[in-house]
């Protein structure tokens, strides 16, 4: 058993049929010594008396808010949560496996630049009685500070018969060094509590590996005289690190017909303009990627060809 | 060239070669995103590699003030990786494919380090840790880790030279 926060405790249980469970001793936070009784949740049934209560925690029915009273007055609470371990593996019932970029990916994180600011998100089908707490650091043995905000519900989607909820959190490294080569990864830890179930999820990454620039901005076409070619031009996204002579991007320009079955025309360039062949009903799209490190491409910025 | 007395390197040549190094480093080990090498407990291997750190003056302001600190750090790293790529980690079993970019990568690391340090001028270089994996699978894992680490190193070096070529070239 360990303390998650004040008056909230997590009991770690090996979860299998007829498991013996864990013996837990609760102590009433009071100077009083006599006349103390214990109850669980809203029940008035007295579970025991005395300053301490010893219980055998085996299942969710044994978890909940234990309260010690004296003469009708509440003295203190202890909330017990369960953390299940099945076949040596901690349960991951609360969050959905996003399976990208690999299986058992529950947390996904992205950064728009090298400033040390990043966003993480996760998915669940649970809509109520759900709380999240996020902590982060750079490195684990001698951790350096990363400050995370509160996790918020950022999107709701319907997936077949189910509703899916996306939560996200923004974090900022306290003393970021955008130009340095990272040697210690960022660690992100999410505590998830659903009713009386506790789970924790972690992710470890370098900012450079989660970089995904915003799409190029100000995408414009200039038709070339007496030609079916157009000059496409664009600018670096505002959110990208500066100066651009140091934090450079490379770009992919794509001409795509109205159908996915049409062949694409792609041009790769380090410049912020390119000349491509335009055709009726096609669209021109541009996306960006760090020029020197192959992290994610941005989403496309698009304009119609005509 | 970064010669004694602190005159400028051939920024544009360094830029071109460092960008080529980035391309080669990724073509030598493109599937890195699909292997979480940090899970493999790599403290004893990649903790020893020279990283370009915050105080090394490789940021735009540091380069403007005095690029020599940064160039020396880059040079150390280039020599370090050049020696690693020439070691039995890469020359031993399992053999690299004949068309593997590792050979080109090795040559380009040497080329860039020579651009930074002409003959007769010596910066101190970092000791290469004695990494002698006994099993071929250990060697393979070590190669992946070294290339992964090299990708990060050459990305910073390429940014330095791109910025230098754009703003510090005479």
């Amino acid at each position: 058993i360990w303390e998650l926060k004040k008056d909230v405790y997590v009991v770690e249980l090996d979860w299998y049929p007829d498991a013996p469970g864990e013996m837990v001793v609760l102590t009433c936070d009071t100077p009083e010594e006599d006349g103390i009784t214990w109850t669980l949740d809203q029940s008035s049934e007295v579970l025991g008396s005395g300053k301490t209560l010893t219980i055998q925690v085996k299942e969710f029915g044994d978890a909940g808010q234990y309260t010690c009273h004296k003469g009708g007055e509440v003295l203190s609470h202890s909330l017990l949560l369960l953390h299940k371990k099945e076949d040596g593996i901690w349960s991951t019932d609360i969050l959905k496996d996003q399976k990208e970029p690999k299986n058992k990916t529950f947390l996904r994180c992205e950064a728009k630049n090298y400033s040390g600011r990043f966003t993480c998100w996760w998915l669940t089908t649970i809509s109520t009685d759900l709380t999240f707490s996020v902590k982060s650091s750079r490195g684990s043995s001698d951790p350096q500070g990363v400050t995370c905000g509160a996790a918020t519900l950022s999107a709701e989607r319907v997936r077949g018969d189910n509703k899916e909820y996306e939560y996200s959190v923004e974090c900022q490294e306290d003393s970021a060094c955008p130009a340095a080569e990272e040697s210690l990864p960022i660690e992100v830890m999410v505590d998830a509590v659903h009713k009386l179930k506790y789970e924790n999820y972690t992710s470890s990454f370098f900012i450079r590996d989660i970089i995904k620039p915003d799409p190029p901005k100000n995408l414009q076409l200039k038709p070339l005289k007496n030609s079916r070619q157009v000059e496409v031009s664009w600018e670096y996204p505002d959110t990208w690190s500066t100066p651009h002579s140091y934090f450079s991007l490379t770009f992919c320009v794509q001409v795509q017909g109205k159908s996915k079955r049409e062949k694409k025309d792609r041009v790769f360039t380090d410049k912020t303009s390119a000349t491509v062949i335009c055709r009726k009903n096609a669209s021109i799209s541009v996306r960006a990627q760090d020029r020197y490190y192959s992290s994610s491409w941005s989403e496309w910025a698009s304009v119609p060809c005509s | 060239r970064a010669v004694p007395g602190g005159s400028s390197p051939a920024w544009t040549q360094c830029q071109q070669l460092s960008q080529k190094l980035c391309t080669l480093a990724w073509s030598a080990h493109p599937l890195v995103g699909h292997m979480d090498l940090r899970e493999e407990g790599d403290e004893e291997t990649t903790n020893d590699v020279p990283h370009i750190q915050c105080g090394d003056g490789c940021d735009p302001q540091g380069l403007r003030d005095n690029s020599q600190f940064c160039l020396q750090r880059i040079h150390q790293g280039l020599i370090f990786y050049e020696k690693l790529l020439g070691s039995d980690i890469f020359t031993g079993e399992p053999s690299l494919l004949p068309d593997s970019p590792v050979g080109q990568l090795h040559a380009s690391l040497l080329g860039l380090s020579q651009l930074l340090q002409p003959e007769g001028h010596h910066w101190e270089t970092q000791q290469i840790p004695s990494l002698s994996p006994s099993q071929p699978w250990q060697r393979l894992l070590l190669r992946f880790k070294i290339l992964r680490s090299l990708q990060a190193f050459v990305a910073v070096a390429a940014r330095v030279f791109a910025h230098g070529a754009a703003t510090l070239s005479p």
Epitope: N226, S227, Q229, G257, R261, D265, F268, T275, I277 | -
Partner: antibody, heavy 114, light 106 residues
């Protein structure tokens, strides 16, 4: 407006050969350009296409045939030629992409023989 | 992608009708064109986007179909229509000619 292929000749097996397509009356760089071949007495066979810089090839042509362009020409570079590659090679202009070929050259004959 | 063209050859009287079929091995929407080639000449585009007639091509040539099944119909065949006709289909990675249909006008 017209297209003309050049470079076709008699070569021995294994010899590399480059064919060139030039345009009159319009700018090649404004169009997707395609190479097609036809063996003596045979049907038409699509080799590949070049857009602005993207290239597409028939599966049998990948690795052995390379299409490239300059502002005024489109080249077809062929390596490891065999007698099976004996054919008339046409270059053609795509109206939109590479299936609606509205302008064709007269073709150039490549003969591979030992 | 495979384009199967039938028949391999067909005879028609002047004024008659010829129908040539082309079947794609997968859905290519309307990315199909028809070409006419006479002996010793370069191919000529007749129809593109499955049914759009190229300018200058007589209206007796008609293209139809989409997806996997396509047809070229020549109504009121003329002597000058004697030639080999090819379909050409395209998807997002490749482009393939049909085997050709030789039209003999009797």
């Amino acid at each position: 407006q017209s297209l003309e292929e050049s470079g076709g000749r008699l070569v021995t097996p294994g010899t590399p050969l480059t064919l060139t397509c030039t345009a009159s009356g319009f700018s090649l760089s404004s169009y997707w350009m395609t190479w097609v071949r036809q063996a003596p007495g045979g049907g038409l066979e699509w080799i590949g296409t070049i857009a602005t810089s993207s290239t597409y090839y028939a599966s049998w042509a990948k690795g052995r045939f390379t299409i490239s362009r300059t502002s005024t020409t489109v080249d077809l570079k062929m390596t490891s030629l065999t007698t099976e590659d004996t054919a008339t090679y046409f270059c053609a202009r795509g109206l939109t992409t590479d299936y609606d070929l509205d302008l064709w050259g007269p073709g150039t004959l490549v003969t591979v023989s030992s | 992608l495979v384009m199967t063209q039938t028949p391999a050859s067909v005879s028609a009287a002047v004024g008659g009708t010829v129908t040539i079929n082309c079947q794609a091995s997968e859905d290519i929407e309307s990315y199909l064109a028809w070409y006419q080639q006479k002996p010793g000449q370069r191919p000529k585009l007749l129809i593109y986007s499955a049914s759009t007639l190229t300018s200058g091509v007589p209206s007796r040539f008609k293209g139809s179909g989409s997806g996997k099944q396509f047809t070229l119909t020549i109504s009121g065949v003329q002597r000058e229509d004697a030639a080999t006709y090819y379909c050409l289909g395209a998807d997002d990675t490749t482009t393939v000619f049909g085997g050709g249909t030789k039209v003999v006008v009797v």
